[in-house]
Interface confidence: low
């Protein structure tokens, strides 16, 4: 149409104009297009310079929204990590604290002589929620070790109690139960409370972190192209009025997007598992009942060895002969008052309920979020035609877009008409995470199974949210025990069924 | 490697105020107490306090309660020291030290030296 | 609060020597903890749980007693042993250090 050769380009100007570029670049009218590499040759009112402008802001402009949607997901996940690691944290800083309130009062000496023993617990259990790699059955194990020899110190300060005689005290102690059942109790149900706390909690660190990096890929030089066409081509060709077919949009997003589309599946693998770990935050093994009564078993535990101590003292003797009398020494220690025990089972607060009745929710509302992302850029930053509208832009003109819409994922693109995808070169880094988000999903199945597993962290480059801190000095792969002289056997049996580990460690 | 890395010395006037760093690597912040001893010729070692880095929880010795307060930064993985009214007997060298599990100071700082001087 | 003596405030000591000093607090205390200082450096863990060796120390140091009554012994004194020692308890706060017991090489 020869007089469509003449038609002004003034609406592309507005456009151009607004986006910050310079108006000179833009011609008067149109002209010829046999210079354009990305929109079809037509007449046109883009010159190649204002084609590569354009080329290069689309691609920005797909970026930013792309890391626009990822953002809210991560402020999502993270506002979710801090609300349960706050709740975790106070049942167990409560606990301590509860205990350094109570015990002095309820066990005078034989709780201030080893209040930091007590505390090195609740620092240990810290650690071990924060991803330590330390092993929570030895770690209790060698507590309760070490607070029987102290104990049994102080309540016998007359009795001379060289080591070689601690030693036979603690080979003793695990047929002679001197606690009772208490760490037993506290063993079976901390070791479940704290894995299902800290997976539950990792596993929102991983998936937050997975979201982060995978907003960092860049878009490859295939996609820019395709994306320009999809947005300004339009306007180039002098239909700036014509937005895009729904169907072309969602196909360059899905081509642009393939890889990402990739982590669906083990995105909701890791979320499924997340969603069924917080059944084991209730009960009388749960979280919450657990963590914050860590000091109810300890008072239980340390009431058992006081009632418990003639015949413990009289067992103990019989296994290890008469120790020598300390002639410095005081007589017995008197016997004490119990302790007054807290209700075990804390009555719910209500705020866990709360917490996972929303992390439920929002956790389901993001499992599809790496497969809808195209449509939902599409629908939300695109500016769409309808579905009905037979005169939208399907990349070469105003009309209806012919094409199927491509499947989901990096296999189902290679037949894709608007981006070249190489099927055969998966992006690296996205795999790398879809390999985070599996061993967290096998994390977190282990736990749901009461199993500890070695929780270093995840994340490939260290960077990750809180998830661990891989070796921590003195924690670090701990199978021995914590006694270092050389004439001691480790005294790892004061826990029944804790055979004595082999090796010793310095400190 | 647990490291604990001090700021550097500080020459303050009577009656000013000096705040002390101890930045922690290698090894979980919030996990281990954090203590602070003042070394003085001629009052040897003394121990100042000690916070708890996940709480914020101190506990002090009286004998520094209206001089000394302690806090930390999660974030930066670093303790502090703030003296504050100081006098020429607040000279010393001060250290921030780790306390590893089971009562003990493993590991120290290289100590800050401040001197209150007109 | 628990005050820590330590006796004799300084000692000297041949190469290959045995050196023993002493510690006593003013009140029973369940363990004793030890540190050696050189000048310049900061002080460093040689014993802690009274008779326990920390990581990286000679065996020819040990640590022992009960109660209030403590000692640390060399069982050969060598050059790099010339330090000040110090004495810590850990039984009740506020936690105190006696005052050092000076070692210098003969």
């Known amino acids: 149409d020869p007089a469509s050769k003449s038609r002004s380009c003034g609406e592309v100007r507005q456009i151009y104009g607004a986006k910050g570029f310079s108006l000179s670049d833009v011609p008067q009218a149109e002209i010829s297009g046999e210079h354009l590499r990305i929109c079809p040759q037509g007449y046109t009112c883009c010159t190649s310079e204002m084609e590569e402008n354009l080329a290069n802001r689309s691609h920005a402009e797909l970026e930013t929204a792309l890391r626009d949607s990822s953002r809210v997901l991560q402020a999502m996940l993270a506002t979710q990590l801090r609300s349960f690691d706050d709740h975790f944290q106070h049942l167990l800083n409560d606990s301590e604290r509860t205990l350094q309130a109570t015990f002095p009062g309820a066990f005078g000496e034989l709780y201030t002589q080893n209040a930091r023993a007590f505390r090195d617990l609740y620092s240990e259990l810290r650690l071990y929620y924060r991803g330590a790699n330390l092993h929570l059955e030895e770690t209790l194990a060698e507590f309760w070790a070490r607070l029987l020899e102290r104990l049994f110190k102080q309540l016998h300060p007359q009795l001379l109690l060289p080591d070689d005689y601690l030693d036979c005290l603690g080979k003793q102690a695990e047929a002679l139960r001197p606690f009772g059942e208490a760490p037993r109790e506290l063993r079976l149900r901390a070791t479940r409370a704290f894995v299902a706390a800290r997976s539950f909690v990792q596993g929102l660190g991983v998936a937050s972190d997975v979201v982060r990096k995978v907003a960092q890929v860049p878009l490859g030089p295939e996609c820019s192209r395709a994306v320009m066409k999809l947005v300004y081509c339009a306007h180039c060709l002098g239909v700036p009025g014509a937005r895009p077919c729904p169907d072309y949009c969602r196909n360059v997003l899905k081509g642009c997007l393939a890889n990402q589309a990739d982590l669906d599946a083990e995105w909701r693998n890791l979320l499924d598992s997340m969603v069924l770990i917080t059944d084991k935050f209730w009960g009388t093994s749960g979280v919450e009942s657990v963590i914050g009564s860590v000091h109810t078993w300890l008072a239980e535990a340390i009431n058992a060895l006081q009632d418990n101590r003639d015949t413990l003292t009289a067992k103990v003797i019989q296994g290890c002969g008469n120790p020598k009398v300390n002639p410095q020494g005081p007589g017995p220690e008197e016997k004490r008052r119990r302790g007054k025990l807290a209700p075990r089972e804390r009555p719910p607060s209500g705020t866990l309920e709360k917490l996972v009745s929303e992390a439920k929710a929002q956790l389901r509302d993001v499992q599809d979020f790496w497969i809808s992302l195209p449509g939902t850029l599409c629908s939300e930053k695109m500016a769409l035609s309808t579905a009905s509208d037979d005169r939208c832009w399907n990349g070469m003109a105003r009309g209806r877009y012919l094409p199927e819409v491509m499947g989901d994922g990096l296999a189902n693109q290679i037949n894709n008409p608007e981006v070249e995808v190489d099927i055969t070169k998966p992006d690296m880094t996205i795999r790398q995470q879809i390999m985070q988000l599996k061993i967290m999903t096998n994390r977190l199945r282990s736990a749901y199974n009461g199993n500890d597993v070695d929780f270093q962290d995840a994340s490939d480059d260290g960077s990750g949210s809180g998830s661990g801190d891989g070796c921590l000095d003195d924690l670090c792969s701990r199978k021995v025990s914590r006694k270092s002289s050389s004439s001691r056997t480790p005294l790892t049996h004061a826990l029944p069924g804790l055979s004595e580990q082999e090796g010793q460690k310095t400190s | 490697e647990v490291q604990l890395q001090q700021s550097g010395p500080e020459l303050v006037k009577p009656g000013a105020s000096v705040k002390i760093s101890c930045k922690a690597s290698?090894?979980?912040?919030?996990?281990?107490?954090m203590h602070w001893v003042k070394q003085s010729p001629e009052k040897s070692l003394e121990w100042i306090g000690e916070i708890n880095p996940s709480t914020g929880d101190t506990t002090y010795n009286q004998k520094f309660k209206a001089k000394a307060t302690l806090t930390v930064d999660k974030s930066s993985s670093t303790a502090y020291i703030q003296l504050k009214s100081l006098t020429s007997e607040d000279s010393a060298v001060y250290y921030c030290?780790?306390?590893?599990?089971?009562?003990?100071?493993?590991?120290w700082g290289q100590g800050t030296l401040v001197t209150v001087s007109s | 609060q628990i005050v820590l003596s330590q006796s004799p405030a300084i000692m000297s000591a041949s190469p290959g020597e045995k050196v023993t000093m002493t510690c006593s607090a003013s009140?029973?205390?369940?363990?004793m903890y030890w540190y050696q200082q050189k000048p310049g450096s900061s002080p460093r863990l040689l014993i802690y749980d009274t008779s326990n060796l920390a990581s990286g120390v000679p065996v020819r140091f040990s640590g022992s007693g009960s109660g209030t009554s403590y000692s640390l012994t060399i069982s050969r004194m060598e050059a790099e042993d010339a330090a000040t020692y110090y004495c810590?308890?850990?039984?009740?706060?506020?936690?105190?250090f006696g005052a050092g017991t000076k070692l210098e090489l003969k």
């Open positions: 009140s029973s205390v369940s363990y």
């Open positions: 290698g090894y979980s912040f919030t996990g281990y107490y």
């Open positions: 030290a780790r306390e590893r599990n089971y009562d003990r100071f493993a590991y």
């Open positions: 810590q308890q850990w039984s009740s706060y506020p936690l105190t």
